[in-house]
């Protein structure tokens, strides 16, 4: 890093510097290097860009090893191809008011960076760019089939049936993902769905995954120990392959399933995770599908008729999905 040793330059000729970065001789007068820019670390060998009025500020005379490229007092700024004098203010766009100060540009947002939390009046808030407006504004996504306007119907809205549990705020979008619905089948391969706006356009979309609460062929009741009424998570002795429309999972899985009760209770998944499963079909085609994997089950008396989709969604949602 210092100039005491002999000159050693990279084998290739002069380096190619990014646009606007000067090609200069290093501080030892040995090799041509790309000049360090404002705020970057500099050394004796890695000099700052002299064409921009920058110098290597080592902070204290004792420290002469590594400094920071700093602009001389009153140095101008180059921003978006325009030169601004020190102390000059300018609007870089309708969204930002900027000021040049000693070679450094600082900008303040002109648009509100406010956050909007969900409420009965606006369950799925997101920021959008409206035509003719500079700043993005909050809009509230209404579910497609909501015909009556007003929070008094909050309990019956689609997104509330699925139960939005917003947890994350991304740039201009309150990311919300609902809990997974109950599996559409009590045994065998079924479908579980959820609603999310966790996508590039912040639009509500429906996601689905395969699910199997328990195999249909398993006779689980005979495994219930004497004196017990339930077997919550029966042990599956051997790894299994999943089947889907004539296609078979490429890998074998030692999956957990939910058990049964003899006292009228039903056992459903409580904690789940979602993983991709590859299926190979007889024609050689391989397809990848997301599938629910059970971590824990719970036994309870909320056992609505399986054909009542809304009731089953309400009572038997998947909680605590890890994916």
């Amino acid at each position: 890093q210092n100039c005491s040793g002999p000159c050693r330059c990279p084998a290739e000729q002069a380096p190619r510097c990014p646009a606007g970065v000067s090609l200069v001789l290093d501080g030892c007068g040995c090799c041509r290097v790309c000049a360090k820019q404002l705020g970057e670390l500099c050394t004796e060998r890695d000099p700052c860009d002299p064409h921009k009025g920058l110098f290597c500020d080592f902070g204290s005379p004792a420290n002469r090893k590594i400094g920071v490229c700093t602009a001389k007092d009153g140095a101008p700024c180059i921003f978006g191809g325009t030169v601004y004098r020190s102390g000059e203010s300018f609007q870089s766009s309708c969204k930002y008011q900027c000021t040049c100060l000693d070679g450094a540009v600082g900008c303040m947002p002109l648009c509100s960076m406010d956050v909007r939390l969900p409420s009965p009046d606006c369950p799925f808030p997101r920021r959008v760019k409206l035509p003719g407006k500079c700043c993005e504004e909050w809009v509230c996504d209404e579910p497609k089939d909501q015909t009556v306007v007003g929070p008094a119907l909050a309990a019956y809205r689609l997104e509330d049936t699925f139960g939005p549990d917003p947890t994350m705020i991304r740039a201009n979008c309150l990311v919300q993902t609902t809990e997974w619905s109950a599996c559409s089948k009590t045994c065998g391969m079924g479908i579980s769905t959820r609603v999310t706006n966790d996508n590039a356009s912040c639009r509500l979309e429906k996601q689905s995954r395969l699910c199997m609460v328990r195999p249909c062929e398993a006779d689980l009741e005979e495994n219930i120990k004497k004196g017990k009424k339930c077997i919550r998570t029966p042990k599956i002795s051997k790894p299994i392959k999943f089947e889907l429309s004539g296609c078979t999972s490429v890998k074998t899985y030692r999956a957990k399933f939910c058990g049964v009760c003899t006292d009228g209770r039903c056992c459903t998944p409580h904690r789940t995770t979602t993983l991709p499963v590859e299926f190979k079909c007889p024609d050689g085609e391989v397809m990848k599908k997301n599938m629910m994997f059970i971590k824990t089950c719970a036994c309870h008396y909320n056992c609505p008729g399986d054909n009542d989709i809304f009731e089953s969604l309400y009572y038997r949602k998947m909680y605590g999905d890890m994916a």
Epitope: D114, C122, W138, C140, V149, A154, R157, P166
Partner: antibody, heavy 114, light 110 residues
Framework: EVTLKESGPVLVKPTETLTLTCTVS????????VHWIRQPPGKGLEWLGV???????DYNAAFMSRLTISKDTSKSQVVFTMTNMDPVDTATYYC????????WGQGTTVTVSS | ESVVTQPPSVSGAPGQRVTISCRSS?????????ANWVQQLPGTAFKGLIG???NRAPGVPDRFSGSKSGTSASLAITGLQAEDEADYYC?????????FGGGTKLTVLG
């Protein structure tokens, strides 16, 4: 910066009507609703009502017959009216922004006394 | 009996984790209740902490978190600090109206 400020009389007589105004800045009343909440001396909070972003209202059933909330979006003002005031209505009255009650006014203390 | 109940007081030492519960006597707390938590510091106005069950309001440190389970919503505060000493209120939405809990006084010991 988001701010809400309540204004109105500090003293009203029993049977009179209380009118409070909540003036907001930093957000639009067409984007956010505004709630009214009160806190009697030494007690907890009581939700009174709300005017939603689209102008609809919901009220606490206990005050339904006495309460009216309206707004003038262009003036960024919400007006709260409570009729037939009683000494038990003595409290600090607050307006708060919808969406997690994230921003509140500083409150205005109203005493009902003859 | 109140529809929404909170413990009157909770306490904890600096650095500890405390939770404040908000119980609905009507049934399970769901996302349709849009559980909210607000803080009232001594002698000052109110400040929203959590909205929509688990979303922090602007400027609220991530030491504060909201959740729900069964018939309760909860506010958890980790790494307790002296300035957290305040009254905390929850509010639950019931289709046409909000109901506030009675409030919980948090005391930071020591």
């Amino acid at each position: 910066e988001v701010t809400l400020k309540e204004s109105g009389p500090v003293l009203v007589k029993p049977t009179e009507t209380l009118t409070l105004t909540c003036t907001v800045s930093g957000f639009s009343l067409s984007t956010f609703g505004v709630h009214w909440i009160r806190q009697p001396p030494g007690k907890g909070l009581e939700w009174l009502g709300v005017i939603w972003r689209r102008g609809g209202t919901d009220y606490n059933a206990a005050f339904m017959s006495r309460l009216t909330i309206s707004k003038d979006t262009s003036k960024s003002q919400v007006v709260f009216t409570m009729t037939n005031m009683d000494p038990v209505d003595t409290a600090t009255y607050y307006c708060a922004r919808d969406g997690g009650f994230d921003y509140w006014g500083q409150g205005t203390t109203v005493t009902v006394s003859s | 009996e109140s529809v929404v109940t909170q413990p009157p007081s909770v306490s904890g030492a600096p650095g500890q984790r405390v939770t404040i519960s908000c119980r609905s006597s009507i049934g399970a707390v769901t996302t349709s209740n849009y559980a909210n938590w607000v803080q009232q510091l001594p002698g000052t106005a109110f400040k929203g902490l959590i909205g929509g069950t688990s979303n922090r309001a602007p400027g609220v440190p991530d030491r504060f978190s909201g959740s729900k389970s069964g018939t309760s919503a909860s506010l958890a505060i980790t790494g307790l600090q002296a300035e957290d000493e305040a009254d905390y209120y929850c509010a639950l939405w019931y289709s046409t109206h909000y109901v506030f809990g009675g409030g919980t006084k948090l005391t930071v010991l020591g």
